[in-house]
Interface confidence: low
């Protein structure tokens, strides 16, 4: 959840044990979730764009207060604006909710380029275009923030969908999705289809546009083509996965696969870019530059700082290579690959000075905290967060942007040996300073 190149967050919240609990084995595996009925009421329930985040409408409190909430698989707190702010059009008013309960505890979440702080409580929460249930969930009421809310983004809070281990202030604060699964019969799984527009959206277009779907408790087969391929969740904190090989236009980067996962690789809907560890980023950019050498771009472009523009409709997609990430498969010595197009990693932006042109930012950037498969990756795929089976599924998204020559792809199986060696083991001492 990165800011600028990152969206705001990078930590989270969750919840103290709650009394409201329906009898249900929380580790019960759902049936093949897509067969449990129609999810039509959840299709198209997201809005937004990759640069400012995708959000879902939620209601909090009694009577219900409606808020737009950023969907963030890279953090674990449900946190909402609870005081006026120049970038908020509405906010959560605890004193107007008859069901609000104060936990008499504060929370402070610093991150690389800013922070938010607030007061912890619980209240009744539901998702109008989600499952027909109401849960009592932990809420961080944000009373102070710096460089967190984004002007024009149209969201007022954040839904951290990762695991309790990275919740703030500590892992005793139960995350929203854990509360949802405990208190209802919703299967322990959700899936995301993020739909990049492929062209810059102005403010009114973003408000009017469909941004995608969050299917809570299942899989909707209409949202993808081909087969779903699953990679194991390595550890339940972030949604951590293992990358075993990287190719640019089919050419192997030929790096020790540990480098790809140094110090981790995560799937994060709250991050804009594909972020790569320093060495991997340098090698990837070198290879992408070589592949696209028919045109020369300023250094600032490759650093994500400068736009490149072409006359409307003339973007030379064909000179840019496809990028393939090979992920560990569910079967021993088997992997599969996901392939994205330049239409995913060149992010359309509005350039006021040259509004007749199509302008883009390079949406691959350097990371000091491992690989982050952010919105530019996720916009190519339908991604299933199968928490019950501790795995993440990828299929080609029915809404991904492509051209007549190439399409995003999910393909396999490939034989890959010693994949376990690709994972990096973070020293215990490092974990206490996680993502501040």
């Amino acid at each position: 959840t990165q800011h600028g190149i990152r969206l705001p967050l990078r930590s989270g919240l969750g919840g103290a044990p709650l009394g409201l609990r329906l009898p249900r084995e929380t580790d019960e595996e759902p049936e093949e979730p897509g067969r449990r009925g129609s999810f039509v009421e959840m299709v198209d329930n997201l809005r937004g764009k990759s640069g400012q985040g995708y959000y879902v409408e939620m209601t909090v409190g009694s009577p219900p207060q409606t808020l737009n909430i950023l969907v963030d698989t890279g953090s674990s707190n449900f946190a909402v604006g609870a005081a006026p702010h120049p970038f908020l059009h509405r906010y959560y008013q605890r004193q107007l909710s008859s069901t609000y309960r104060d936990l008499r505890k504060g929370v402070y979440v610093p991150y690389t380029q800013g922070k938010w702080e607030g007061e912890l409580g619980t209240d009744l929460v539901s998702i109008p275009h989600g499952p027909n249930v109401t849960v009592r969930a932990n809420i961080a009421a944000i009373t102070e923030s710096d460089k967190f809310f984004i002007n024009g983004s149209n969201w007022e809070g954040i839904l951290g969908l990762a695991y309790a281990e990275i919740a703030r202030p500590d892992d005793s604060l139960e995350p929203f999705f854990d509360s949802l699964v405990k208190q209802t019969h919703v299967p322990n799984l959700f899936s995301l289809q993020l739909c990049g527009a492929g062209f810059p959206l102005n403010q009114s277009e973003v408000l009017a546009s469909v941004g995608g779907s969050m299917i809570i408790g299942g899989i909707d087969h209409s949202l993808y083509t081909g087969s779903l391929w699953y990679t194991p969740i390595r550890r339940e904190w972030y949604y951590e996965v293992i990358i075993v090989r990287v190719e640019i236009n089919g050419q192997d980067l030929k790096m020790d696969c540990k480098e790809y996962n140094y110090d981790k690789s995560i799937v994060d809907s709250g991050t804009t870019n594909l972020r790569l560890p320093k060495k991997v980023f340098e090698a990837a950019v070198k290879s992408i530059k070589a592949a696209s050498s028919t045109e020369k771009f300023p250094d600032g472009f490759w650093l994500g700082e400068q736009l490149v523009c072409w006359q409307a409709g003339t973007t030379p997609w064909n000179i840019f290579p496809v990028i393939s990430l090979y992920l560990m498969g569910e079967v021993t010595n088997q992997s599969f690959r996901i392939t994205i197009l330049p239409q995913q990693y060149l992010r359309p932006v509005e350039d006021v000075a040259t509004s007749q042109d199509d302008c883009y930012k390079f949406a691959i950037s350097q990371s000091s905290t491992g690989t982050v498969m952010g919105a530019v990756i996720m916009e190519g795929f339908y991604v299933v967060f199968d928490r019950a089976r501790k795995r993440i599924g990828f299929a080609v998204s029915a809404c991904h942007v492509h051209d007549e020559f190439r399409t995003a792809a999910v393909e396999g199986p490939f034989v890959t040996l010693d994949m376990e060696d690709c994972g990096y083991n973070i020293p215990q001492t490092d974990e206490s300073t996680l993502m501040t």
Partner: antibody
């Protein structure tokens, strides 16, 4: 029933500092969901937002007045205050204090207003 | 800064008639617009927020509509107490919070 009441001198000399206080009664100024604001209205003219303050002291000001305006809060007295420096006749107006409420950014509760005249 | 332009400046009508007041924004403010009523010697009072939602205690004869740049406040049947000045205000982007110049509804 929450009420707001402005107080302060009705006459200020040019180049001096205008000082007003808004007292909140019937409820606490500390409720975290509210911003407290100042708005003014020159005689016979429209409304102009001056600025807002949150209980922590965080402030937002109208850029057209920035540099001259200071809003502060005293939670122990349940009051917030406005100071406008280097006043001229153009600052003559009815000054209102107001609360931002409704879980949104509109002014849902207003004081009755106090007329401040800038004149020597 | 977003500029709000209200029209007409003055509206002369009789009690029982329908009043239609317009507010136009210099750029889109989505639905983040409010209407206030101000009577002589009194503070403004919030009537409508989020373009179309009536504030607490506001009679049903007041309604708001519009989104983007064009908004309308309608008073379906004017009561004697409705003759006043009406202001629109946007909070789509602030600071500053901006108001329109006002429309005076007077008795014909």
């Amino acid at each position: 029933q929450l009420q707001l009441q402005e107080s302060g001198p009705g006459l200020v000399k040019p180049s001096e500092t205008l000082s007003l206080t808004c007292t909140v009664s019937g409820g606490s100024i500390s409720w975290s969901s509210y911003y407290w604001s100042w708005i003014r209205q020159p005689p016979g003219k429209g409304l102009e937002w001056i600025g807002s303050i949150y209980r922590s002291g965080r402030t937002y000001y109208n850029p057209s007045l920035k540099g001259r305006v200071t809003i502060s809060v005293d939670t122990s007295k349940n009051q917030f205050s406005l100071k406008l420096s280097s006043v001229t006749a153009a600052d003559t107006a009815v000054y209102y204090c107001a609360r931002v409420g409704h879980g949104i950014n509109y002014f849902d509760l207003w004081g009755r207003g106090t007329l401040v005249t800038v004149s020597s | 800064e977003i500029v709000l332009t209200q029209s007409p400046a003055t509206l002369s009508l009789s009690p029982g008639e329908r009043a239609t007041l317009s507010c136009r924004a210099s750029q889109s403010v989505s639905s983040y617009l409010a209407w206030y009523q101000q009577k002589p010697g009194q503070a403004p009072r919030l009537l409508i927020y989020d373009a179309s939602k009536r504030a607490t205690g506001i009679p049903a004869r007041f309604s708001g509509s519009g989104s983007g740049t064009d908004f309308t406040l309608t008073i379906s049947s004017l009561e004697p107490e409705d003759f006043a000045v009406y202001y629109c205000q946007q909070v789509y982007t602030w600071p500053p919070r901006t108001f329109g110049g006002g429309t005076k509804v007077e008795i014909k």
